[in-house]
């Protein structure tokens, strides 16, 4: 769920998601449209696709709570939970490390980016 995601992103990136990423660019945060603005925004667009696929599978992406361990900078998703919980954890783990990989190109100007400026073709999944 959303609490899992926030905690994981903070642990991996060291940033407070609510202050740094939700929202950011055209795809980080709720919803998303248009061409991603940078690599960080692409992370979120890919994550949206990951969630969309799990929605198709009937997973409750915002409500399902999963278990994971964070140690020595790595995330280990529990294999004890349901398939949906494991996949949700995998989606969130991927976006957390994607955001971390792209910290060096993070642009403060894209924080609270005005969504009507998000133009162009929304990438397909």
């Amino acid at each position: 769920g959303i609490l899992n995601l926030n905690k994981m992103v903070k642990q991996v990136t060291g940033k407070m998601p609510i202050l740094s990423y939700w929202p950011y660019g055209c795809h980080c945060g709720l919803g998303g449209r248009g061409q991603p603005k940078d690599a960080t925004d692409w992370c979120c667009q890919t994550h949206d696709c990951c969630y969309d696929h799990l929605k198709t599978q009937g997973c409750s992406i915002y409500k399902d709570y999963y278990r994971y361990n964070f140690s020595q900078g790595n995330i280990h998703c529990s294999d004890k939970g349901s398939w949906c919980e494991q996949q949700l954890c995998a989606c969130d783990k991927e976006v957390a490390f994607c955001l971390k990989r792209n910290l060096d190109t993070y642009q403060k100007r894209l924080r609270f980016y005005w969504r009507p400026h998000c133009r162009g073709q929304t990438p397909g999944c």
Epitope: C50, H53, T56, Q57, G58, C59, K63, S82, W83
Partner: antibody, heavy 118, light 111 residues
Framework: QVQLQQPGTELVKPGASVKVSCKAS????????MHWVRQRPGQGLEWIGR????????NYNQKFKDKATLTVDKSSSTAYMQLNSLTSEDSAVYYC???????????WGQGTLVTVSA | DIVLTQSPASLAVSLGQRATISCRAS??????????MHWYQQKPGQPPKLLIY???NLESGVPARFSGSGSGTDFTLNIHPVEEEDAATYYC?????????FGSGTKLEIK
């Protein structure tokens, strides 16, 4: 244990509507999608659509968009499918089914045979 | 919509032998390391029963003589050794995208 209870039969006249029920028990009704599947006599299975009881979010197979309407009553843990403008082509067994983990159907109702006849 | 083509439409297998049922999808149902193909058994007058999910995972309580394999567009359900109680119609179903669709079914008869 998980149960999805459906009435055995519904006899309706051509042009009329019918509301098929599916009462769930043995699990938290609002947590999982409820699906509806049609099976004409001697034929295969067709997915009609699904509804999430927590917020009534629905997805329909376009083929059934104008034929079926899915609703839920959370207070009684019951899902409904209304079929309108019935013709003999709609005579079939209608199943409700729920998926607990991914979009494969773990639990099924016994099915309701809808017969459209004058 | 993804079309699932099952073959054969019917088959007769001797007790203790192997039954092989094929399901071919009109486009790939595999992505992100999973194949979104599932198998059901249906006996007359009963609802379908889940046998295999995600191409090869055995549903709890289903005998180990049932197995599934495949990826992309080609999938197989194997039953070995076949028992009398396996006489039924078998359906594949995908969940790669909406709408979900089923194969046309394969009727298994035990000789």
């Amino acid at each position: 244990q998980v149960q999805l209870q459906q009435p055995g039969t519904e006899l309706v006249k051509p042009g009329a509507s019918v509301k098929v029920s599916c009462k769930a028990s043995g699990y938290t009704f609002t947590r999982y999608w409820m699906h509806w599947v049609r099976q004409r006599p001697g034929q295969g299975l067709e997915w009609i659509g699904r509804i999430h009881p927590s917020d009534s979010d629905t997805n329909y197979n376009q083929k059934f968009k104008d034929k079926a309407t899915l609703t839920v009553d959370k207070s009684s843990s019951t899902a409904y499918m209304q079929l309108n403008s019935l013709t003999s082509e709609d005579s079939a067994v209608y199943y409700c089914a729920s998926n607990w983990d991914g979009a494969w159907f773990n639990y099924w109702g016994q099915g309701t045979l809808v017969t459209v006849s004058a | 919509d993804i079309v699932l083509t099952q073959s054969p439409a019917s088959l007769a297998v001797s007790l203790g032998q192997r039954a092989t049922i094929s399901c071919r999808a009109s486009k790939s149902v595999s992505t992100s390391g999973y194949s979104y193909m599932h198998w059901y058994q249906q006996k007359p007058g009963q609802p379908p029963k889940l046998l295999i999910y995600l191409a090869s995972n055995l549903e709890s309580g289903v005998p180990a003589r049932f197995s599934g394999s495949g990826s992309g567009t080609d999938f197989t359900l194997n039953i070995h050794p076949v028992e009398e109680e396996d006489a039924a119609t078998y359906y594949c179903q995908h969940s790669r995208e909406l709408p979900f669709t089923f194969g046309s079914g394969t009727k298994l008869e035990i000789k």
